[in-house]
């Protein structure tokens, strides 16, 4: 997934999925850019993971976050966003047993290392927004979005009544 | 109630250019990515073509590529199949089918299908 | 393209008994897999999807296991409507897309 050397890499073939319990119902792999199309990029320093907000020259190679969809009890309100009133939930890791996880108590998106089965803050509300874009709102945190604050991604206190279609909560997935 | 509705077949010689239509009512139409899958008399499915629920991304079984076009308009709820240069193994019923989750992504299994319309080729 | 081959290709049973299909891929396909049943005339009805969830109404005897290149579909007593084509299918990464050649369960 990433351009550094010394970082495994995706490969097409698929994480293996046998976890205990929840369990996804697809995985694929794509690329993460902002609604400005901006890239999401992960780079290893000393040795954790930063994640950035970035325009990447024309000919870096975008990196690839897997997104495993697991289906979620509670009803859908959004038309389209679910299927028999459940939502869809995802996981995103970026680079073997690494995911991104909301830090609610610092408003902030971090990147940890950890073993199935995962935990919840490893997991983001799937939601579908206009011009072919999805939001990921926090599973233990509701109303909280990831979004991007300066150039990095940020846990991001969302209004429903005013924000919801706000840019900086809205992101593009390409294969 | 959710449903796809496939027009367009008929019988058509080799060579010839069909274009098949898939009405859908009864969900948002442009959240769900949207397939063709065709079954020959008395065969198999065989998948022929898929597309993301923007449009944006295509995709094609190797047996039909650069002869058929997957496209869908959202506005009209419709989905598209071009068929161009038919030959005698494109006989089939040909089925659009939609995904069971609102991924827009093509990864996903089909949980709606139509009745299916039944393109022959034949001279 | 992913080769996706079912085993066998008839099962021979009695209402009642227990129907084990097998779907093997040529490569690794995750959980990207289903399970379809189909009867003459009509079209394929989904029962399992991400290689083990049952879909919605289908009953409990249906249950579908495997990741990787290995699945299984089980019935565990074979009801009357239950003889048809059963067809696996895989959506994995990098379309082409497939199905497997099917397998017919018919009463004995």
């Known amino acids: 997934a990433f351009g550094i050397s010394g970082v495994p890499k995706y490969t097409r073939a698929l994480h293996d999925s046998s976890i205990t319990g929840i369990s996804p119902i697809t995985e694929s792999l794509a690329s993460l850019s902002t609604y400005n199309d901006q890239s999401i990029t992960f780079a290893l320093e000393d040795e954790s993971y930063e994640i950035y907000v970035e325009d990447l020259k024309k000919d870096k190679k975008k990196d690839k976050v897997l997104l495993s969809y697991y289906e979620s009890q509670h009803p859908s309100s959004e038309s389209g966003d679910g299927v028999d009133g459940k939502m869809l939930m995802v996981t995103l890791s970026p680079t073997k047993d690494f995911w991104l996880q909301a830090n609610n108590k610092e408003h902030s998106v971090e990147l940890h290392k950890c073993e199935k089965p995962l935990p919840d803050q490893a997991f983001f509300v799937l939601h579908n927004r206009s011009f072919n874009c999805v939001s990921f709102e926090c599973k233990t945190d509701p109303g909280v979005f990831i979004g991007v604050k300066d150039n990095h991604l940020a846990l991001i206190k969302v209004d429903y009544s005013e924000n919801l279609g706000s840019e900086n909560i809205l992101f593009k997935l390409s294969e | 109630e959710v449903q796809l509705v496939e027009t367009g077949g008929g019988l058509i010689q080799p060579g010839g250019s069909l274009r098949l239509s898939c009405a859908a009512s009864?969900?948002?139409?442009?959240?769900?990515?949207m397939s063709w899958v065709r079954q020959a008399p008395g065969k198999g499915l065989e998948w022929v073509s898929a597309i993301s629920g923007s449009g944006g991304s295509t995709y094609y079984a190797d047996s039909v590529k650069g002869r058929f076009t997957i496209s869908r308009d959202n506005s009209k709820n419709t989905l598209y199949l071009q068929m161009n240069s038919l030959r005698a193994e494109d006989t089939a019923v040909y089925y659009c089918?939609?995904?069971?989750?609102?991924?827009?992504?093509?990864?996903?299994?089909?949980?709606?299908w139509g009745q299916g319309t039944l393109v022959t080729v034949s001279s | 393209e992913i080769v996706l081959t079912q085993s066998p290709g008839t099962l021979s049973l009695s209402p009642g008994e227990r129907a084990t299909l097998s779907c093997r891929a040529s490569?690794?396909?995750?959980?990207?897999l289903s399970w379809y049943q189909q009867k003459p005339g009509q079209a394929p009805r989904l029962l399992i999807y991400g290689a083990s969830h049952r879909a919605t109404g289908i009953p409990d005897r249906f249950s579908g296991s495997g990741s990787g290149t290995d699945f299984t579909l089980t019935i565990s007593r074979l009801e009357p409507e239950d003889f048809a084509v059963y067809y696996c299918?895989?959506?994995?990464?990098?379309?082409?897309?497939?199905f497997g050649g099917g397998t017919k369960v018919e009463i004995k």
């Open positions: 299918h895989q959506y994995s990464q990098s379309p082409p897309f497939t």
């Open positions: 009864g969900f948002t139409f442009s959240s769900y990515a």
């Open positions: 089918a939609r995904t069971l989750h609102g991924i827009r992504a093509a990864y996903d299994a089909f949980i709606i």
């Open positions: 490569q690794s396909v995750g959980i990207n």
